[in-house]
């Protein structure tokens, strides 16, 4: 579908006759009759099979024609077709004289023909006109002429048919040709899938309009390519929505449960070794030198007591040194040249002859140890107790004293207020709003009943010379522990002096 | 052959929601060429197109109805789905489910579900 | 086009050609379809784009459209023919507007 236009620019009729020669009265008043037909190698007269026009008197014997496309549409002419354009054409103008108003060819005389033209050729799709002049014995037609095609037909025939759009179902313009050219942000055969944001997920992601990245469910992230994990999920990844796939050291339904206490929150001090026992429990393994729960005090050798029989210790650079009282010998003073007659072995420790009675062997009692049974048994330097519990000499045995939230022998269960039993000697347990509290029966004291109140058999001070002062639990006797410098079973006894045993 | 099922309450009260699902049967909803569309006709009234979905979940409602209309799409089922908020007698009609997209025309409907009668009434 | 405007109704002996018509403000501009209900039954696609039968459509089915108004146009019409038929067009706000349906009578 498209359009012939055609514009009448000049017609020259100097002497203003007709084509038979007679002049007009007063003048010729000219107007046009068009035919548009298809090619004809000799155009000959028939059907207008492409269309005809006429013109109303558009001037007389010479004269320009004005463009008048603004007012009416008379000049350029219109022959619209309805119809694939050929590419060629034949065109017959003809010139005519009108002495009345009335323009019909029945209301016509024969001889008021002024002139006619007859042209034929090739003519392409185009907005350029085709500029041409005829000129016959009297007259000379100056005009031009175009084919364009109709509104929403396009392409070298016009037979595209294409109309541009912007809604929903679909955003172009159309091209020269025909097709649809996609406005900026949209794709798809009619234009109507939004581009999304560059790099959204194909599957996880979609927009409703171009430079968007709306997630579908389970997913997030400007560009929807970060699953979401299972809601509550606190030390956890997922590769799929909804999962919760525990960091390393944590476990759970949540990864709430902190299997790795000593990574996340590396408790052992000093360059102690820490061991894993458990959701949020640990062990710490001192270096030499160290100690406590998480091997934050610093130990001197001295202090684990390695003399015995009462002699005094002395920390050095590389170790310690043993001052052993008369009657002992050896690196921890653990060799004795008394006899069974010199009543070596202390509390309540029973005297065996050895090798003739040149030498003894003391068989002590539950929670005394040493040659002389002068040490009271420690059964907490190997740090049995677990989630930082405080080890305690109880008699012949030991004790875990538990931190909150934890229970059991070597506080490895978690248990929670009063369920962890924490009151100690049969203490009766009160669940508090913050806590709890205990109430101890007679004879013990402290928050968890774990202090015994029975008589103390050092709170006389028997022990002289500043030496360190252990009670028997059992017997509710004393055991001194020397300093450099003193022996003797209070210390009383300086190096060198000999003792007068009062036994 | 595509074809088209709609399946719904048959009688809503006023002011509650109609619930409505569309199920495509001999081919797949998610077809890039093809749209899904909802119309609706009152008895003895004309058509009036509702809205449509594409699969990937983009949607496109009447202004007119654009406040109380939503759809959905779910690929797993098949289907796609309307709900219309806070109906009144106006909203009686036979709803049909259509494809959209003949000759590549995103806005052609080819081919209908046989309609589904829905009564607003107390 | 916001509104598409048919007559209600056309009467045509079988055999007669029907023309059943739709206009809108600048209706040409955009792409029409018609549909044929028949009572009872769900609409059916005869004319896309204007001028276009969806295979399975007889030939005595054309469409037209250019300026204001679109046309159908029922050549040698059938009993069979008689039904409700509905255009179809877009605007800028409206992504589908059907025209109001003319219930065509063949006598």
């Known amino acids: 579908s498209g359009v012939f236009q055609l514009q009448l620019q000049e017609f020259i009729n100097e002497r203003g006759v007709l084509a038979s020669g007679r002049p007009c009265e007063p003048g010729c008043r000219t107007f046009f009759r068009v035919c548009l037909k298809h090619f004809q190698a000799v155009v000959s007269p028939g059907p207008c099979t492409f269309g005809t026009v006429s013109t109303p008197v558009l001037g007389t014997n010479s004269f320009a024609v004005r463009d008048d496309s603004s007012g009416g549409g008379r000049n350029p002419l219109q022959l619209p077709f309805n119809f694939t354009w050929p590419g060629t054409f034949s065109l017959i103008i003809e010139a005519w004289h009108a002495p009345g108003d009335d323009l019909r060819p029945e209301a016509l005389p024969p001889d008021a023909l002024i002139s006619k033209i007859a042209i034929q050729g090739s003519l392409a799709v185009g907005q350029n006109w085709l500029l041409d002049e005829q000129t016959s014995t009297l007259t000379r037609l100056r005009y031009s002429y175009r084919v364009i095609c109709s509104d929403n037909y396009y392409g070298d025939n016009c037979s595209r048919l294409c109309k541009k759009r912007n809604d929903h179902f679909g955003h172009y313009v159309c091209q020269p040709d025909g097709n649809l050219s996609c406005l900026p942000g949209w794709t798809g055969e009619y234009c109507q899938q939004p581009i999304c944001l560059s790099g959204c997920h194909e599957q996880n992601g979609y927009c409703s309009k171009p430079a968007e990245c709306l997630c579908r469910p389970g997913w997030q992230g400007r560009l929807c390519n970060e699953c979401i994990p299972h809601n509550g999920c606190r030390h956890g990844t997922c590769s799929t929505p909804w999962q919760c796939t525990c960091d390393e050291g944590w476990g759970g339904l949540f990864c709430d449960q902190d299997l790795n206490y000593c990574t996340h929150h590396s408790p052992c001090k000093n360059g102690a070794t820490c061991s894993n026992s458990g959701q949020r429990s640990y062990t710490c393994t001192c270096r030499p030198g160290y100690t406590g729960v998480d091997c934050e005090l610093e130990l001197s050798e001295c202090d684990s007591n390695p003399c015995r029989n009462g002699g005094s210790c002395k920390d050095q650079e590389d170790g310690y040194h043993c001052l052993c009282p008369p009657g002992y010998y050896g690196l921890h003073c653990e060799h004795s040249t008394l006899s069974c007659a010199d009543s070596p072995c202390f509390n309540g420790g029973s005297c065996r002859e050895r090798n003739q009675g040149a030498n003894y062997a003391c068989e002590c009692p539950p929670n005394f140890t040493g040659s002389n049974c002068e040490k009271k048994v420690d059964r907490c330097t190997s740090n049995p107790c677990a989630n930082g519990g405080q080890c305690l000499n109880r008699g012949p045995s030991r004790m875990c004293r538990c931190r909150p939230g934890f229970t059991g022998t070597y506080c490895e269960l978690h248990v929670s207020d009063c369920a962890r039993n924490p009151c100690a000697h049969g203490g009766t347990c009160h669940d508090l709003e913050n806590g709890l509290m205990c109430t101890c029966p007679a004879g013990f004291s402290g928050r968890r009943c774990e202090v015994r109140t029975s008589i103390d058999a050092c709170a006389s001070s028997p022990c002289f010379n500043r030496a360190t002062c252990y009670t028997d639990l059992s017997t509710d006797t004393f055991v001194c522990n020397c300093p450099y410098g003193f022996v003797g079973s209070r210390c009383e006894f300086p190096v060198g002096l000999p003792p007068s045993f009062p036994w | 052959q595509l074809q088209l099922q709609e399946s719904g309450p048959g009688l809503v009260k006023p002011s509650e929601t109609l619930s409505l699902s569309c199920t495509v049967s001999g081919g797949s909803i998610s077809s890039s060429s093809s749209y899904w569309g909802l119309i609706r006709q009152p008895p003895g009234k004309g058509l009036e197109w509702i809205?449509?979905?594409?699969?990937?979940?983009?949607?496109y409602y009447s202004p007119s109805l654009k406040s109380r209309v939503s759809i959905s799409v779910d690929t797993s089922k098949n289907q796609f789905s309307l709900k219309l908020s806070s109906v009144t007698a106006a909203d009686t009609a036979v709803y049909f489910c259509?494809?959209?997209?003949?000759?590549?025309?995103?806005?052609?409907?080819?081919?209908w579900g046989q309609g589904t009668m829905v009564t607003v009434s107390s | 086009s916001s509104e598409l405007t048919q007559s209600p109704s056309v009467s045509v002996s079988p055999g007669q050609t029907a023309r059943i018509t739709c206009s809108g403000d600048k209706l040409g501009d955009v792409y029409v379809r018609w549909y044929q209900q028949k009572t009872g039954q769900s609409p059916v696609l005869v004319i896309y784009e204007d001028t276009k039968r969806p295979s399975g459509i007889p030939e005595r089915f054309s469409g037209s459209n250019s300026g204001n108004t679109a046309t159908l146009t029922i050549s040698g019409t059938q009993v069979m023919d008689e039904a409700d038929y509905y255009c179809?067009?877009?605007?800028?706000?409206?992504?589908?507007?059907f025209g109001g349906g003319t219930k065509l009578t063949v006598l």
């Open positions: 809205g449509s979905i594409y699969y990937s979940g983009s949607t």
């Open positions: 259509a494809r959209q997209g003949y000759g590549g025309h995103p806005d052609v409907f080819d081919i």
């Open positions: 179809q067009a877009w605007d800028s706000t409206t992504a589908v507007i």
